[in-house]
Interface confidence: low
């Protein structure tokens, strides 16, 4: 798996999307976990509803929320009030029994709040509404 980079601004929300094959992963719950070190385990942060049919319902653990579009095949994780300590490697997982398949490896990068920095280039209002993925990390 290649790592996909998602960027968010400190204090704001970041949405991470993990596309998957909806047929292959039919009936499976999903999870979002944080990679502990390069070779370490992936520590569960939040998982979708215990009843797969209710996967569309948003589940939350602290500032992290998860919801699954099982028909469209897209798992969405929202990190609210993004902080520097949220930066790091994560995984979207598909669960079956005690096993977990990696759907996507994710690197979350936290950019400093631009309004904290007073150089001319930092204070301009956005000209268009692209996601943080658009500029630097298309894939």
């Amino acid at each position: 798996h290649n790592t996909t980079v998602f960027q968010g601004v400190e204090g704001q929300s970041l949405q991470v999307s993990c596309p998957y094959d909806s047929m292959k992963h039919w009936g499976r719950r999903k999870a979002w976990c944080r990679q502990l070190g390069e070779k370490g385990p992936c520590q569960r942060v939040v998982s979708t509803h215990n009843l797969w049919l209710l996967s569309f319902l948003r589940r939350r653990n602290g500032s992290t929320a998860i919801t699954d579009d099982t028909l469209g095949g897209t798992l969405t994780i929202t990190l609210r009030n993004l902080q520097p300590h949220d930066a790091g490697f994560y995984q979207c997982q598909s669960l079956h029994g005690s096993e977990a398949d990696t759907l996507r490896k994710v690197l979350v990068e936290v950019l400093a709040d631009p309004l904290d920095h007073r150089d001319a280039g930092d204070l301009w209002v956005p000209g268009e509404s692209e996601s943080f993925e658009d500029a630097h990390v298309e894939h």
């Epitope: 290649n2 280039g121 301009w124 996601s131 658009d134």
Partner: antibody, heavy 123, light 112 residues
Framework: QVQLVQSGAEVKKPGASVKVSCKAS????????MNWVRQAPGQRLEWIGR????????NYAGKFQGRVTITADTSASTAYMELSSLRSEDTAVYYC????????????????WGQGTLVTVSS | DVVMTQSPDSLAVSLGERATINCRSS???????????LHWYQQKPGQSPKLLIY???NRFSGVPDRFSGSGSGTDFTLKISRVEAEDVGVYYC?????????FGQGTKLEIK
């Protein structure tokens, strides 16, 4: 200190391929984007593409799509740029350049450049 | 792709005089995160490019304070307050707001 050392000059025939290497030292290679930029004689700098060595993610300029492959070997802290189906217009100096990501502020500018590799395409 | 256009193409300035280079982009360089990723590079004869200014107006480490950058949106300026002999070379503006990254055609600075 950060250093990017590129492989030596190459002379290739039209239709051939070339692979240029860029060995990085002095920083965490796997967590910084590496860019490839070229400069044909008397021309402006031209961005070819980039790689995120830690995951292998790549982006290429449309002009080079399908003809260029950028790879990285994290164990050797080395990035590679391979260009195929060479033509005379590909004669240029090819540079690797690290993308500066300074917290706070994430500048996304190329702060360190290799010395350049001259690739000459001639029959 | 974002097209970057510099003016003038070349510039001859006396030592100690001020040099001004302009750069215009074909679309706004303001990213949705409110940052403007416009940078300036200097390339001396026979050398690799070097970063001078990043994000419009921030001097890279080791760059003398006679170099300054300004601008917003689509129009940007690099100023050298007192040109020295070592400043001879080609100056490029570049954007990294959108992939593919693009460069201006360059402005050649010479000493009168």
């Amino acid at each position: 200190q950060v250093q990017l050392v590129q492989s030596g000059a190459e002379v290739k025939k039209p239709g051939a391929s070339v692979k240029v290497s860029c060995k990085a030292s002095g920083y965490a290679f796997s967590s910084q984007w590496m860019n490839w930029v070229r400069q044909a004689p008397g021309q402006r700098l031209e961005w070819i593409g980039r790689i995120y060595p830690g995951g292998g993610d790549t982006n290429y300029a449309g002009k080079f799509q399908g003809r260029v492959t950028i790879t990285a070997d994290t164990s050797a802290s080395t990035a590679y740029m391979e260009l195929s189906s060479l033509r005379s217009e590909d004669t240029a100096v090819y540079y690797c350049a690290r993308l500066l990501r300074n917290q706070p502020g994430e500048s996304y500018a190329m702060d360190y450049w290799g010395q350049g590799t001259l690739v000459t395409v001639s029959s | 792709d974002v097209v970057m256009t510099q003016s003038p193409d070349s510039l001859a300035v006396s030592l100690g005089e001020r040099a001004t280079i302009n750069c215009r982009s074909s679309q706004s360089l303001v990213h949705s995160n409110r940052y403007t990723y416009l940078h300036w590079y200097q390339q001396k004869p026979g050398q690799s490019p070097k970063l001078l200014i990043y994000k419009v107006s921030n001097r890279f480490s080791g760059v003398p304070d006679r170099f300054s950058g300004s601008g917003s949106g689509t129009d940007f300026t690099l100023k050298i307050s007192r040109v020295e002999a070592e400043d001879v070379g080609v100056y490029y503006c570049s954007q990294s707001t959108r992939v593919p990254y693009t460069f201006g055609q360059g402005t050649k600075l010479e000493i009168k």
